[in-house]
């Protein structure tokens, strides 16, 4: 519910079309979820990453840029 995932390909699909729903497996949860684009009200939600919306839970989730971690990709990954 707001957990971050890293961006390498192992994370599965990201949404291409702004309005499309897609399935993805996050590295943290290891379960399938359906994602859509985030509402524009969340345009600044993810500090260093991309926002996607967990449709079933109606919550934003961040896919962090490489080298960043945290629910909002707000922390540098010291182990990267």
């Amino acid at each position: 519910d707001g957990n971050s995932t890293r961006s390498p390909e192992t994370n599965g699909l990201l949404c291409g079309d702004p309005d499309e729903n897609c399935a993805a497996t996050t590295t943290q949860s290891k379960r399938k979820g359906h994602f859509s684009r985030c509402p524009k009200q969340y345009k600044h939600y993810c500090i260093k990453g991309r926002c996607r919306f967990v449709v079933t839970e109606q919550t934003p989730s961040c896919v962090c840029d490489e080298g960043y971690i945290g629910a909002r990709c707000e922390r540098v990954d010291l182990f990267y």
């Epitope: 707001g2 702004p18 684009r37 009200q41 109606q58």
Partner: antibody, heavy 121, light 107 residues
Framework: QVQLVQSGAEVKKPGSSVKVSCKAS????????ISWVRQAPGQGLEWMGG????????VYAQKFQGRVTITADESTSTAYMELSSLRSEDTAVYYC??????????????WGQGTLVTVSS | DIQMTQSPSSLSASVGDRVTITCRAS??????LNWYQQKPGKAPKLLIY???NLQSGVPSRFSGSGSGTDFTLTISSLQPEDFATYYC?????????FGQGTKVEIK
């Protein structure tokens, strides 16, 4: 069961300010976004602004920017809406409404009973 | 701002009728749309969230559909307590905006 209880009706003079309160019970007050929506007599619903949890601050509709202030006191589970420089067109029922999300402003699943503010000289 | 336009602005119907109300957004809002019912002197009540999800406690005769810019609220069999005004609301972007409302009256 979540309940939002608003302060009573107000009659104000043009140019003055009004502050309406909204006390929440039965839920985790600080986790949810509280918005203010107004409805002029015989008119539709108009969102004025709201506190956005992930931002930790209020966001306002441009129309009310600089004239409205939305605040919350977590210690008393009460949200406030203050509207200044009142004019006759501000005569309306003012509702507080809770967002269904603990992140942003989504659907308004709980509403206060409304507070009628009448602006008249 | 995202403009929300409802049609019709009012309609007359009888108990048992199937009623359809449409809402159009001025730009694509994906499925970030809610529907409310309001009766005179009362606060609005959430019926449908995220375009098609029925809010808990709302009768199944209410349903919502649509995505992008065009959305529909359907009442499959109108009941006496359904005579009210209905509003759509987008939550894609600030400011949150509502449609102007559709009043459902008794024929």
């Amino acid at each position: 069961q979540v309940q939002l209880v608003q302060s009573g009706a107000e009659v104000k003079k043009p140019g003055s300010s009004v502050k309406v309160s909204c006390k929440a019970s039965g839920g985790t007050f600080s986790s949810y976004a509280i918005s203010w929506v107004r409805q002029a007599p015989g008119q539709g619903l108009e969102w004025m602004g709201g506190i956005v949890p992930w931002m930790g601050e209020a966001v306002y509709a441009q129309k009310f920017q600089g004239r409205v202030t939305i605040t919350a006191d977590e210690s008393t589970s009460t949200a406030y809406m203050e509207l200044s420089s009142l004019r006759s067109e501000d005569t309306a029922v003012y509702y507080c409404a809770r967002s269904s999300s603990t992140y942003g402003i989504h659907a308004f699943d709980y509403w206060g009973q409304g507070t009628l503010v009448t602006v008249s000289s | 701002d995202i403009q929300m336009t409802q049609s019709p602005s009012s309609l007359s119907a009888s108990v048992g009728d199937r009623v359809t109300i449409t809402c159009r957004a001025s730009q694509s809002i994906s499925n970030f749309l809610n529907w409310y019912q309001q009766k005179p002197g009362k606060a609005p009540k959430l019926l449908i969230y995220a375009a098609s999800n029925l809010q808990s406690g709302v009768p199944s005769r209410f349903s919502g559909s649509g995505s992008g810019t065009d959305f529909t609220l359907t009442i499959s069999s109108l009941q006496p307590e359904d005579f009210a005004t209905y509003y759509c609301q987008q939550y894609d972007d600030f400011p949150m905006t509502f449609g102007q409302g559709t009043k459902v009256e008794i024929k």
